[in-house]
Structures are given as structure tokens and as C-alpha cells.
């Protein structure tokens, strides 16, 4: 560091800023000597508002330093980002955002639950709010799924009028034909491939409505489609195997008692979907009078033995193998309780008695030409077979 040029005068002795130190320490600093400033942990080099990673000053010929002394300012992580569907609380003190300050994120009660971490973040020396797991990204308030005003799957009976909050996952899909779907999370709709096949390349043509009971009501929450994902194994006009699709919404919907997603089945869900277990189908499809329902209707129907269902659809006009392992059947042998045209894409839901949440077991897919016909059953896409497919699309997009 020493370059002895006696003609030049020494530079003023560098006084370290508070919370910083000078290196190297010398008795005097002359031409071309230099020093650096290092800040204590939790403090950062700033020249006014401008951040610096390092600071070195050099002594000039005229006996002045080539740059002014920076400050070692306490690291300030700044106001924490807003958490969608949540809030943040300052734990250390009102508005305190400096080094070692603590904040606590929480989600809006009832309808959202926190994912990723416990929501506690600390302002660390690098200037980022950091969770106890070391994450610098926000936690996620994920909508609570499967909440319904209905607490049990009641007796088997014909079409009943749904009440507010009974099927808050129910989605009405318009644009071409009338169909249905079920809300997943807060920006996806699960439906049948055949219901949206015509719109697969024109997703924006789908008019998606939710939060309403009346099909023709002007009071509903509007959503629009960003993209339609049809299962690659679905072949239009060649049976209904893999009759499943996902619609990505272009915006997240606000969750409330009238708009709540349905749960996807857990691995253990099969135990709630055995033969004779009751599922509930809902929709605005054709009623016994042959018209689309004005009010959202639902029917509680039992799962039918798979072999029995396969046999029912083995005879003409149905081609052999119409009922596949990717389908489940529900209905009464005597007929009268069924889903019908216009219900397609809607969810057949079951109550998971362990979690006390409703989950989607089936998607309304196809059935006999005459809905509710004796000896014939409604056929539903077996959702549990598609959990990896659903999860991959949702995580990728």
C-alpha cells in the first residue's frame, strides 16, 4: 500500500463510519494508498440511497480521497409484500423492517390455509425477508377445499333444489353448449373433455360463471378461460375414455361461502367410493320435464358395481368395452335418479368422513340416451386415476 512520493501531501485520516471499520489501518495514508470499509453484520454500505457491495478509496496527489466516505446503514428489508388472501403483522414493532425484525403472515380465516411455511419471516443481513426454512418467497394462502353447507350425503332421492353454499364448487360453462365444471384451487376448473372439446383452440370463447344457483341469473361471478387442457388419451367421437379436461382461468377467483373449490381425492379416497356408497351429482341439466333446470339441482346416487355397469352397456347400441377402468358408474337399477345432458363436466362428489371435506370422485361423462333409465346408469370419469395428470398440469402451468 505504501508508495513514497514525498512531494505529495498525506490524505486525511479515514474515520470509519458508525457500525463499520477501516482496513488496513495505517499511521498515515499518502499518494496511491487505499483503504476499504467493511460493515458489521446487519449493516450495508450505502452512498445515500444507492447500495454498494464494496468500498475502496484511493489517496490522490492533492491530498484528498477520490471518493466520499459511505455510511454503514442498518439493513432495511422494506415493507413486506402483500400476501394475496392474507395479511401481515409486524411483531417487532409497528412498521419495523430493519435487520432482525420479525413479521408474521396469516391467511384469511375459514376459506384459506397457509402452505409452504408457518408464515414467520425475519429481516436477514442480505436485506430479504426470510422464513425459518430459509425461503425468500411469500407463503401461499391456498383456498380451503370441500367446504359445503351440506354436512352429510342424505338419502337417495330425485332432483332436489340446491341451497346457497351447498355446491360452492359448481361452475356453469357456456359457449357452444351448456356444461358444468368444478372449481379446483382458485384458478382451475375440472370438467369433461367432451364438454369443452370444441373450444380447445379458442379458450377465450368459454363463458365461465360461478357463485350462483340460478342458471339465468345476472348475479354471478364471471371468470374467463386462459387455456384448455384436454387429456391426450381422449378421442372425440370414439367413446368417452379419458373424458377429462382442465380449464385454467385467467384470474384467481375470490373464495367465499358461495365459491369454494372441491378437494381432489386423497389416496385413501377409494374407501369412500365403494359399491353402494352415496355420491352427489349437481347441475343445471335436463330434468324429468325435458328442459334445462333453472335452479341448480342435485341428486344423491349410489355407486354401482363396476361389472354390473359394464354389463349394462355391453349390449347394442353400445360398442363392447364402452365402460373402461377409467370410469365409475352411479345410479339406481330402478332408474329415476341420474345426471343428464347439460350436467356434463360437473362433479360427482363424496364426503370424506375423516377430513370432513367433500372431494370429487367422478366427472359427469355419459350415459343412456334416456337419462334415469331403468337398468342403465350414469357413467363418470374416475378422477382418482388422473391425479398425476391433474397435478402435473397445475404445477406446470
Amino acid at each position: 500500500h505504501h508508495h513514497h512520493h514525498h512531494a505529495s501531501q498525506p490524505c486525511p485520516y479515514p474515520m470509519a463510519p458508525p457500525n463499520g471499520h477501516v482496513s488496513p489501518v495505517q499511521a498515515k495514508y499518502i499518494l496511491k494508498d487505499s483503504f476499504s470499509i467493511f460493515c458489521e453484520t446487519g449493516y450495508e454500505l450505502l452512498q445515500g440511497h444507492l447500495p454498494l457491495k464494496s468500498f475502496t478509496a484511493v489517496c490522490q496527489k492533492d491530498g484528498s480521497w477520490d471518493r466520499p466516505m459511505p455510511a454503514c446503514s442498518i439493513v432495511d428489508c422494506g415493507p413486506p409484500d402483500d400476501l394475496p388472501s392474507g395479511r401481515v403483522e409486524y411483531i417487532t414493532g409497528p412498521g419495523v423492517t430493519t435487520y432482525k425484525a420479525v413479521i408474521q403472515y396469516s391467511c384469511e380465516e375459514t376459506f384459506y390455509t397457509m402452505k409452504v411455511n408457518d408464515g414467520k419471516y425475519v429481516c436477514e443481513a442480505d436485506g430479504f425477508w426470510t422464513s425459518s426454512k430459509g425461503e425468500k418467497s411469500l407463503p401461499v394462502c391456498e383456498p380451503v377445499c370441500g367446504l359445503s353447507a351440506r354436512t352429510t350425503g342424505g338419502r337417495i332421492y330425485g332432483g332436489q333444489k340446491a341451497k346457497p353454499g351447498d355446491f360452492p364448487w359448481q361452475v356453469l360453462i357456456l359457449g357452444g353448449t351448456t356444461a358444468a365444471g368444478a372449481l379446483l384451487y382458485d384458478n382451475w376448473v375440472l370438467t369433461a373433455a367432451h364438454a369443452v372439446y370444441e373450444q380447445k383452440h379458442d379458450a377465450s370463447a368459454l363463458d365461465i360463471r360461478m357463485g350462483t344457483l340460478k342458471r339465468l341469473s345476472p348475479h354471478y361471478t364471471q371468470a374467463w378461460s386462459e387455456a384448455v387442457f384436454i387429456h391426450e388419451g381422449y378421442t372425440h367421437d370414439a367413446g368417452f375414455d379419458n373424458d377429462i379436461a382442465l380449464i385454467k382461468l385467467n384470474n384467481k377467483v375470490v373464495i367465499n361461502s358461495n365459491i369454494t373449490p372441491i378437494c381432489l381425492p386423497r389416496k385413501e379416497a377409494e374407501s369412500f367410493m365403494r359399491t353402494d356408497d352415496i355420491g352427489t351429482a349437481s347441475g343445471w341439466g335436463l330434468t324429468q320435464r325435458g328442459f334445462l333446470a333453472r335452479n341448480l339441482m342435485y341428486v344423491d346416487i349410489p355407486i354401482v358395481d363396476h361389472q354390473k355397469c359394464t354389463a349394462a352397456y355391453e349390449k347394442p347400441p353400445y360398442p363392447r368395452g364402452s365402460v373402461t377402468a377409467n370410469m365409475l358408474c352411479a345410479g339406481l337399477e330402478s332408474g329415476g335418479k341420474d345426471s343428464c345432458r347439460g350436467d356434463a363436466g360437473g362433479a360427482l362428489v363424496f364426503l370424506d368422513s375423516e377430513t370432513e371435506r367433500w372431494f370429487v370422485g367422478g366427472i359427469v361423462s355419459w350415459g343412456s340416451m334416456n337419462c334415469g333409465e331403468a337398468g342403465q346408469y350414469g357413467v363418470y370419469t374416475k378422477v382418482i386415476n388422473y391425479i398425476p395428470w391433474i397435478e402435473n398440469i397445475i404445477s406446470d402451468f
Epitope: 445515500g48 457491495k53 464494496s54 442480505d126 430479504f128
Partner: antibody
Framework: DVQLQESGPGLVKPSQSLSLTCTVT?????????WNWIRQFPGNKLEWMGY???????SYNPSLKSRISITRDTSKNQFFLQLNSVTTEDTATYYC???????????WGQGTSVTVSS | IVMTQSQKFMSTSVGDRVSVTCKAS??????VAWYQQKPGQSPKALIY???YRYSGVPDRFTGSGSGTDFTLTISNVQSEDLAEYFC????????FGSGTKLELK
């Protein structure tokens, strides 16, 4: 030598988002300093919009905070501006600049003109 | 923080000495820079920390001041100095002055 180059659409419709890229050559944006977006309105008034620091931290002009986002791609040595819900008032020449308050030279891009119009 | 350059235009002659002023609405210490901008070009930094000259900047440009009052002085004005001059405070966020245009008398 350090060089900065702005790129992006010259015309944006009202209510849409304005997105610009600044490509830096001759210096790594993670090495040091603040990497800024500054705009100059017709009539020459300059407005600092915000910066992303060498560590990835951001600071925004309080008047723009609800609409602005500055991000970076360190692998491409680029940083980005996104300004949402633009109006005709956002018509300006947009500059990216490395500012250090005297710690190293200041470097500015040549600027890119953006018009907001339907 | 508002940076006020009260003179929008200043008339000068080659060889003159001219002082461009800038006033901060609150104390900004010495965290002030000066920029020169010519038509069709991006701003060029002249001065940092109120009084430090960037390398390559002619020594006829000097900066002074601290707190709220700052001055850029050009002694022996040259024709290439005819441009617009902006001050910038970087003490709390960053704000520019409105500019002072130097023109020939």
C-alpha cells in the same frame, strides 16, 4: 467498457402493461451497484422509477410502487421493467442506467421511446 | 424530496463563467450529482457527491454545496457546454431537478 441497451415495444395500449429489457455488457449486474430505470417525459423532465441492486433487492419510486416491478435474469445479465395499467401519461423515453453515487462511472443506455396510445 | 432548479434557461457567452443552482426541499447531505444532456443524447454524469468530478470531465466544471443548496459552476464556457443541466439527489430515493438550459446570448 460497460454498455447498457434498452429494448421493448415502442407502442403500448392504455391499461396494458409496458415491459422493457435492459441488456448489460462489459460488467456483471451481480458484481456491484444499483441498476436503475429512469424515464424522460416530453419536455425533458426526468423521473427515477426504481432500481434493482447487485443483490437483487429493489427500491421503487413511491409514486409508482403500486404499478412497477423490476426483476432480473442474472444468467443473461439483463434486468427488466414492468409498468402496469399504463396511461397516456406514461409516454416517455425510458433509460436504464448504472448509478453508483461516484463509485465507478455512471453509465446510461441510449434510451427507448415508448408511446401509450390506443 | 423536491429538487428545484429555479432558472429554466441561462444565457451565456463563450469564455464566461456561469453558475447553475439547485435547491433541495430538505437536507440531502452531499448526495447530489450533476448531469449534462445534449439533444438526442442520454444524460452524461459530470459531478458526484456535490463536489467530486468524474474522470474525463474537464476541470472547468466544479460542484459545490451541501445540505440544501448546490451549485454547478462552469468557468470559461465552451460552445460544447451548451446543453441542459440536471441535478440529482440520491440521499432519499432519487429525484432530479427540472433542468436548466444553457444557451448563447
Amino acid at each position: 467498457d460497460v454498455q447498457l441497451q434498452e429494448s421493448g415495444p415502442g407502442l403500448v395500449k392504455p391499461s396494458q402493461s409496458l415491459s422493457l429489457t435492459c441488456t448489460v455488457t462489459g460488467y456483471s449486474i451481480t458484481s456491484d451497484y444499483a441498476w436503475n430505470w429512469i424515464r424522460q417525459f416530453p419536455g425533458n423532465k426526468l423521473e427515477w422509477m426504481g432500481y434493482i441492486s447487485y443483490s437483487g433487492r429493489t427500491s421503487y419510486n413511491p409514486s409508482l410502487k403500486s404499478r412497477i416491478s423490476i426483476t432480473r435474469d442474472t444468467s443473461k445479465n439483463q434486468f427488466f421493467l414492468q409498468l402496469n395499467s399504463v396511461t397516456t401519461e406514461d409516454t416517455a423515453t425510458y433509460y436504464c442506467a448504472k448509478l453508483g453515487g461516484g463509485h465507478g462511472m455512471d453509465y446510461w443506455g441510449q434510451g427507448t421511446s415508448v408511446t401509450v396510445s390506443s | 424530496i423536491v429538487m428545484t432548479q429555479s432558472q429554466k434557461f441561462m444565457s451565456t457567452s463563450v469564455g464566461d463563467r456561469v453558475s447553475v443552482t439547485c435547491k433541495a426541499s430538505q437536507n440531502v447531505d452531499t448526495n447530489v450529482a450533476w448531469y449534462q444532456q445534449k439533444p438526442g443524447q442520454s444524460p452524461k454524469a459530470l459531478i458526484y457527491s456535490a463536489s467530486y468530478r468524474y474522470s474525463g470531465v474537464p476541470d472547468r466544471f466544479t460542484g459545490s454545496g451541501s445540505g440544501t443548496d448546490f451549485t454547478l459552476t462552469i468557468s470559461n464556457v465552451q460552445s460544447e457546454d451548451l446543453a441542459e443541466y440536471f441535478c440529482l439527489q440520491y440521499n432519499s430515493y432519487l429525484t432530479f431537478g427540472s433542468g436548466t438550459k444553457l444557451e448563447l446570448k
